[in-house]
């Protein structure tokens, strides 16, 4: 069973290039090959996929994975129930949104269990890993000759997103973007009715409720113009 | 090869503060986690404060308020401001780095780390 596992773009660095682990020398650990990052993800606060990089591993290695919520009540030790794999071997856990408390430090322990000495224990902040659903049912109203309102719902709590609307003509080689606090509206001040516009829009889990650097993905795009303006000049649907 | 080379610590009554920190040689700190972590006579080496490169700090629970990790990448060096220091906190404090791909990766377990400083004594006498 292959999984896909999500790797945004812009958080990844290939400088980790070291593999040997030198300890203090008052340390008794020997020097261990170290164990493959960890990276969470928590998805619409639904559910919350933690994955690592199983062909790290020198040889196939079933890695196992173990939570907490540090200083809470959820702070015994938790075996993961779901595993992801990836070539028959593990490479992540999903957790269901009962096991996800996004304001509590989770902690995050890789073990190998053919060798129990050899673990990582990582600390994350959940709230900075929520990706939100793309935005849907994007509308278009015409307020005025010249000006065009989008409207978009997210399956989330509006207050907790921000987001990135973009839009450009059939004439342009470029997006035009503009950032969107939470009240999910965008409003185009002059409109060409010569040209077909296209918009589309993405959310992100900043600043209000979390400090999330990932963004949803682009929602499908709505068009407006040329070609459906002259039939009903109000009145338009979404296209994907 | 990296160098981390702790400074900072001394003799200290309690309730005093002291800024200890670590400056490293050999490679940029900006994509590394980086920790602090001590070690007192009899005791398993803790951490005391553990970042990742993106900015996500923690401490271990008896310091949480207490001490402060800060970084300058310029300068690639990281601080642990340490206030209201108490008896127990005192121990031999070390910096440890560790080279992540992600920029939330931050590590609780000391064997994660590939460098480590000389460490600095941190002495608090009541």
């Known amino acids: 069973l292959n999984t896909t596992i999500l790797t945004p773009n812009g958080n990844e660095d290939t400088t980790a290039d070291f593999f040997l682990t030198t300890m203090p020398t008052d340390s008794l650990s020997v020097s261990t090959l170290p164990l493959p990052e960890v990276q969470c993800f928590v998805f619409n606060v639904e559910y919350m996929n933690c994955t690592w990089n199983s062909s790290s591993e020198p040889q196939p290695t079933n890695l196992t994975l173990h939570y907490w919520y540090k200083n809470s009540d959820n702070d015994k030790v938790q075996k993961c129930s779901h595993y992801l794999f990836s070539e028959e071997i593990t490479s992540g856990c999903q957790l269901q949104k009962k096991e996800i408390h996004l304001y509590q430090t989770f902690v995050v322990q890789l073990q190998d269990p053919r060798e129990p000495r050899r673990q990582a224990t990582q600390m994350l902040k959940l709230q900075n890993l929520v990706i939100p659903w793309a935005p849907e049912n994007l509308t278009l109203h015409k307020l005025s000759e010249s000006q065009l309102e989008l409207n978009w719902n997210n399956r989330f709590l509006n207050h907790c997103l921000e987001h990135l609307v973009q839009y450009r003509t059939d004439w342009d080689h470029s997006w035009t973007e503009q950032s969107v606090d939470y009240r999910h509206k965008f409003s185009l001040p002059s409109v060409d009715g010569q040209k077909r516009y296209t918009f589309r829009v993405r959310s992100r889990f900043n600043p209000l409720c979390g400090s999330a650097q990932h963004w949803s993905e682009w929602s499908h795009p709505i068009h407006w113009g040329s070609n459906t303006s002259k039939e009903n000049p109000f009145l338009f649907a979404l296209e994907a | 090869q990296v160098q981390l080379v702790e400074s900072g610590g001394g003799l200290v009554q309690a309730g005093d503060s002291l800024r200890l920190s670590c400056v490293a040689s050999g490679r940029t700190l900006s994509r590394c986690a980086m920790g602090w972590f001590r070690k007192a006579p009899g005791k398993e080496r803790e951490y005391v404060a553990i970042?990742?490169?993106?900015?996500?700090?923690f401490y271990e629970d008896s310091v949480e308020g207490r001490f402060t990790f800060s970084r300058d990448n310029a300068k690639n060096t990281v601080y642990l401001q340490m206030n209201s220091l108490r008896p127990e906190d005192t121990a031999v404090y070390y910096c440890?780095?560790?080279?992540?791909?992600?920029?939330?990766?931050?590590?609780?377990?000391?064997?994660?780390?590939?460098?480590w400083g000389q460490g600095t004594q941190v002495t608090v006498s009541s």
């Open positions: 970042s990742s490169w993106g900015g996500d700090t």
């Open positions: 440890a780095a560790a080279p992540t791909s992600f920029a939330t990766t931050a590590y609780s377990s000391s064997n994660s780390y590939a460098y």
